[in-house]
């Protein structure tokens, strides 16, 4: 397996509960405004044929796309809790900024496309999915990284 | 065949401890968080927590922190889950189980060690 | 106490359809998984993700969601679907996984 270096999180990143409880807030108030329940961006696909130690990898992959084609183009949605939950993404995002995968990443890159793709497919109603899955992102990234 | 085994019954006495194994067979062990779940009849399922098997790092239910521990091998893809200073209440049926994230279904369970506290 | 409510048990004919609901708080945001536990054995999951069904279940088990209640639907039941049944979620707050207290399917 390639090897990922600098991929880590410190864990008391995860351990604010003031900004955490925002975060699941911004992703519930969203998902309340997601009307496709059929589709899911971060789930088994997302992590299939990713092993463990490449998974940090993968979610600052995800983290950088949901910031910046998501969550900057909606900012001024779901106040106020987006005005103080994406510059603590994007301070988890330039933490990241350092972790690579020496080797082939091309299986990350493609469920990464493939997110990227869907979310892109369903327009609008696709970043709105994106937000109200927040909380899976940031338990992932808590998962994946620390 | 993907499959996680589990160690034998065990009969207890209050105080004392235990340590129930499960091997997992016919997949990455490293990929796959190891949850540990009880059955009793009066609680029904209680989850007590996760073990990551490629770091060792784990999350405990608030209930269970401070007071069960939970371990792998990866040597043998064996997870360990050890209770101490058992109580009666503790009577129960210990599930090891598979998820993917740890937060996804449990897809593949152990077949289950009952562990009896009687004095 | 589970947070998550199930009806304590549901009796069907065979052939007939049977219907299984789980109810709980904020589960907009959450994802619903069922298993199903025969006497004895190890619970098996049926459904994740609200409506997938996993590769060996039969078709005629199927979920779907409305607000804060969670439905398995088992259609053309068979004796052999008799068996107590779980809902579970994985709640991010309290960071743990929960379950419903459990319904017992009666093939009549």
């Known amino acids: 397996a390639p090897i990922s270096s600098h991929c880590r999180l410190d864990k008391s990143n995860f351990q604010q509960p003031y900004i955490t409880n925002r975060t699941f807030m911004l992703a519930k108030e969203a998902s309340l405004a997601d009307n496709n329940t059929d589709v899911r961006l971060i789930g088994e696909k997302l992590f299939h044929g990713v092993s463990m130690s490449e998974r940090c990898y993968l979610m600052k992959q995800v983290l950088n796309f949901t910031l910046e084609e998501v969550l900057f183009p909606q900012s001024d949605r779901f106040q106020p809790y987006m005005q103080e939950v994406v510059p603590f993404l994007a301070r988890l995002s330039n933490r990241l900024s350092t972790c690579h995968i020496e080797g082939d990443d091309l299986h990350i890159q493609r469920n990464v496309q493939k997110l990227k793709d869907t979310v892109k497919k369903l327009g609008e109603s696709g970043e709105i999915k994106a937000i109200g899955e927040l909380d899976l992102l940031f338990m992932s990234l808590r998962n994946a990284c620390i | 065949e993907v499959q996680l085994v589990q160690s034998g019954a065990e009969v207890k006495k209050p105080g004392a401890s235990v340590k129930v194994s499960c091997q997992a067979s016919?997949?990455?062990?490293?990929?796959?968080?190891i949850h540990w779940v009880r059955q009793t009849p009066g609680q029904g399922f209680e989850w007590m927590g996760w073990?990551?098997?490629?770091?060792?790092?784990?999350r405990y239910a608030q209930k269970f922190q401070g007071w069960v521990t939970m371990t792998r091998d990866m040597s043998n893809t064996t997870a360990y889950m050890e209770l101490p200073r058992l109580r009666d209440d503790d009577t129960a049926v210990y599930y090891c189980?598979?998820?993917?994230?740890?937060?996804?279904?449990?897809?593949?369970w152990g077949q289950g060690t009952l562990v009896t506290v009687s004095s | 106490q589970s947070v998550l409510t199930q009806p304590p048990s549901v009796s069907v004919a065979p052939g007939k359809t049977a219907t299984i609901t789980c109810g709980g708080n904020?589960?907009?945001?959450?994802?619903v998984h069922w298993y199903q536990q025969r006497p004895g054995q190890a619970p098996v999951l049926v459904i994740y993700?609200?409506?997938d069904r996993p590769s060996g279940i039969p078709e005629r088990f199927s979920g779907s969601r409305s607000g804060n209640t969670a439905t398995l639907t088992i259609s053309r039941v068979e004796a052999g679907d008799e068996a107590d049944f779980y809902c579970?979620?994985?709640?991010?707050?309290?960071?743990?996984?929960?379950f419903g207290g459990g319904t017992k399917l009666t093939v009549l």
């Open positions: 189980a598979r998820d993917l994230t740890g937060f996804d279904p449990f897809d593949i």
């Open positions: 016919g997949y990455t062990f490293s990929d796959y968080y």
């Open positions: 073990v990551n098997p490629d770091t060792g790092g784990t």
């Open positions: 904020n589960f907009r945001n959450k994802r």
């Open positions: 993700y609200d409506s």
């Open positions: 579970q979620v994985w709640d991010f707050l309290t960071d743990s996984g929960s």
